[in-house]
Interface confidence: low
């Protein structure tokens, strides 16, 4: 089937400047298929921006500024890109890319989608470094005792832009594991959040990590954080009466 | 012209039951297609259904359509509704497929579902202590109703922060509150939920050992964070 | 392993009804379509019937139209031919088929299914005659 | 409906030869063509999807091509399990159609 990522998952830019926001597209050849770019303003109506056809045919929607938007296709890397000039206010959205799939039913199709890049207009010059600053906590004695089960901590501070997407795996799979997230803080000028993972007490002896996206994370790769694994048998338990 | 209308901007429905979320459009096109699209916290865009102009009422699993075209009506029904259910819904039209056109997607504004926990009997928390330098983690879990305080008790706070408190899997609530202490060592955690007070304290264990699960001796307990 | 095991033929009169069944295994008929071929003896390949059983869609060859009903059961993990007014010309091994599983590219003139059909049953013999 | 029209009936060659048989659709299927090997008694192998995708395990002496509305299956050096029916099949459009088919011979 056709897949589209949107490897930015934030692009920040100050004003006046140019923003190019990637789609990548899998499963399909792009040089086969039409890519559509939508945007999602605040509080309004997700709407459509420009599509580059299979032989290259650029169409705009009709209100939209001239010169304002570019978009390309690029085949040896099965790109697209969406070029914002002279970035301003009112072009913080989240922008999609998006192609028709057919389906199953002959003949029919439906729209897929990109899982958005957000476009984020600041207007300090942060030089300092706002990728995210890991911590980690291991479980309690007395949640592994007691429960059977232990809970990991993966904190992140020091952030900026807002965006970032957490999950967890164990080590050598690549299955999604199921964690629950606080939201994101602000402290000052940058941001924190937090993200626990609690597993059963046969899994304590493996090697968990915290997979991070962030558009600051160093050389533009997930941040992985290693929680590395625990022996519960150290200590024998008397839990206090209640 | 064309247009799409979703009337609601929210609704709340408990699990288990059904709702029917509203979509009215204008077209003049004699064949298009409606589709409604689930729109994650995260923004990610997942197609749900599609129903065609021409069609009979399409259904997929949970997702059921009720297709009025005189009344150019689409109502998406979700039924047995799930927890994760709880997302913003996209109602859009499809323009037909002509060469000379942009075969686009005009979107309605969305209607955000909420889906509550199934109402089930009241769950004193766990409540846990979980430590990294000054940092303090109280981990409180499996409580029900989700009403709860979160005192991290110390005499030497830097700061803390307002505790993230997420619905788990069973319809109970987890949550977790942090801050950063000075004396992190013996900061403990106390929680007031339905009227009582829980401790930290009554789930510790008499150990000769640390406060914390031991790291297999293999394992480097310095954790860098891999770029 | 992808399976696809058709039974339910055998000689019938003309007007007669026969149901034929295609057991599925290795892949689920809720996710896939599933579709029947038949071929009179020392004749070509001739489809008949189609369905789509997550949407409810059927689509039959305008020759078993109003009396062939292609079905699925997804807790059996089974499609069926119900072939009713059977005539002499009905007469045939019949094949059920699952369409491969490579999405097509999507052509600004129009999209389609790949129904091109990787997996097979071994065929099911159907005679009509009186 | 799209009609297949395939050509030749039958055809015979030797083990070593180059086959090409071809199929013309009636109005456009895009790249909606497959082309399947059947043995008697047998039920049909998928060789060709999307009118020049060799399906997997199927050996590379077998491929496919499109021009407009013409498709070929070529044969580079025939072998003698090679020795068969081919048909041809559309699925641009219901009602799904299939080519009379090809009898490929020993000479």
């Known amino acids: 089937a056709g897949h589209l990522e949107q490897p930015q998952i934030s692009s920040t830019k100050t004003l006046s400047k140019t923003a190019r926001l990637e789609c990548v597209v899998s499963g399909i050849t792009i040089s086969a298929t039409s890519v559509y770019w939508y945007r999602e303003r605040p509080g309004e109506v997700i709407q459509f921006l420009v599509s580059i056809s299979y032989d290259g045919t650029v169409r705009k929607e009709s209100g939209i500024p001239s010169g304002k938007f570019e978009v390309d296709r690029i085949p040896e890397t099965s790109t697209s890109t969406l070029t914002i000039h002279n970035v301003e206010k009112q072009d913080i959205a989240t922008y999609y890319c998006a192609l028709w799939e057919a389906q199953q039913e002959l003949g029919k199709k439906i729209k897929v989608f990109g899982p958005g890049t957000k476009l984020i207009i600041t207007d300090k010059q942060l030089d300092a470094d706002v990728s995210p600053k890991p911590t980690i906590f291991l479980p309690s004695i007395a949640e592994t005792k007691l429960q059977k089960a232990g809970t990991y901590l993966c904190l992140l501070e020091k952030f900026f832009p807002d965006v970032i997407k957490i999950h967890w795996e164990e080590k050598k799979s690549n299955t999604i594991l199921g964690s629950q997230e606080g939201n994101t803080m602000k402290t000052n000028d940058t941001y924190m959040k937090f993200s626990w993972l609690t597993v059963p007490e046969k899994s304590l002896d493996k090697e968990h990590r915290c997979i991070v996206r962030h558009e600051n994370n160093k050389n533009g790769v997930d941040q992985e954080i290693i929680f590395p694994p625990i022996k519960t048998d150290v200590i024998t338990m008397d839990p206090k009466d209640n | 012209a064309q247009k799409v209308t979703q009337a609601q901007s929210s609704v709340s429905m408990p699990v288990r039951k059904a709702v029917t979320l509203n979509c009215l459009y204008e077209t003049s096109w004699w064949s298009y297609y409606i589709f409604w699209y689930k729109q994650l916290p995260s923004k990610e865009m997942i197609f749900l259904i599609r129903q065609g102009s021409d069609e009979q009422n399409a259904k997929s699993g949970r997702y059921s359509v009720n297709f009025k075209k005189a009344a150019k009506s689409v109502a998406l029904t979700i039924s047995a509704l799930q927890l994760e259910d709880s997302a913003k819904y996209f109602c859009a039209l499809g323009e037909p497929n002509h060469f000379l056109n942009t075969d686009k997607l005009i979107f309605g504004k969305g209607t955000r579902v909420t889906v509550e926990p199934r109402s089930q009997p009241h769950t004193k928390p766990s409540v846990f202590v979980m430590k990294n330098g000054t940092n303090v983690a109280c981990l409180v879990k499996e409580f029900y109703p989700k009403d709860i305080r979160i005192n991290l008790v110390s005499s030497k706070k830097i700061t803390e922060f307002d505790p993230a408190i997420v619905i788990s899997p069973s319809g109970k609530y987890n949550a977790v509150k942090l801050g950063k202490y000075e004396d992190s060592n013996s900061v403990t955690c106390s929680v007031q939920h339905d009227n009582k007070t829980v401790h930290s304290t009554d789930f510790e264990v008499k150990t000769d050992s640390t406060d914390h699960v031991k790291p297999k001796e293999t394992e480097n307990t310095k954790q860098p964070s891999k770029s | 392993e992808v399976q696809l095991v058709e039974s339910g033929g055998g000689l019938v009169q003309p007007g007669g009804s026969l149901r034929l069944s295609c057991a599925a295994s290795?892949?689920?008929?809720?996710?896939?379509?599933i579709h029947w071929v038949r071929q009179a003896p020392g004749k070509g390949l001739e489809w008949v019937a189609s369905i789509y059983s997550s949407s409810g869609y059927t689509y039959y060859a305008d020759s078993v139209k109003g009396r062939f009903t292609i079905s699925a059961d997804t807790s059996k993990n089974t499609a069926y031919l119900q072939m009713n007014s059977l005539r002499a010309e009905d007469t045939a091994v019949y094949y059920c088929?699952?369409?491969?599983?490579?999405?097509?590219?999507?052509?600004?003139?129009?999209?389609?299914?790949?129904?091109?059909?990787?997996?097979w049953g071994q065929g099911t013999l159907v005679t009509v005659s009186s | 409906d799209i009609q297949m029209t395939q050509s030749p009936s039958s055809l015979s060659a030797s083990v070593g030869d180059r086959v090409t048989i071809t199929c013309r659709a009636s109005q456009s299927v895009s790249s909606a063509v497959a082309w399947y090997q059947q043995k008697p008694g047998k039920a049909p192998k998928l060789l060709i999807y999307s009118a020049s995708s060799l399906y997997s395990g199927v050996p590379s002496r077998f491929s496919g091509s499109r021009s407009g509305t013409d498709f070929t299956l070529t044969i580079s050096s025939l072998q003698p399990e090679d020795f068969a029916t081919y048909y041809c099949?559309?699925?641009?459009?219901?009602?799904?159609?299939f080519g009379q088919g090809t009898k490929v011979e020993i000479k």
């Open positions: 088929a699952r369409p491969y599983y490579w999405y097509p590219y999507y052509y600004w003139s129009g999209g389609w299914e790949y129904a091109a059909f990787d997996y």
């Open positions: 099949q559309q699925y641009g459009e219901y009602p799904i159609t």
């Open positions: 290795g892949f689920t008929v809720s996710s896939s379509s």
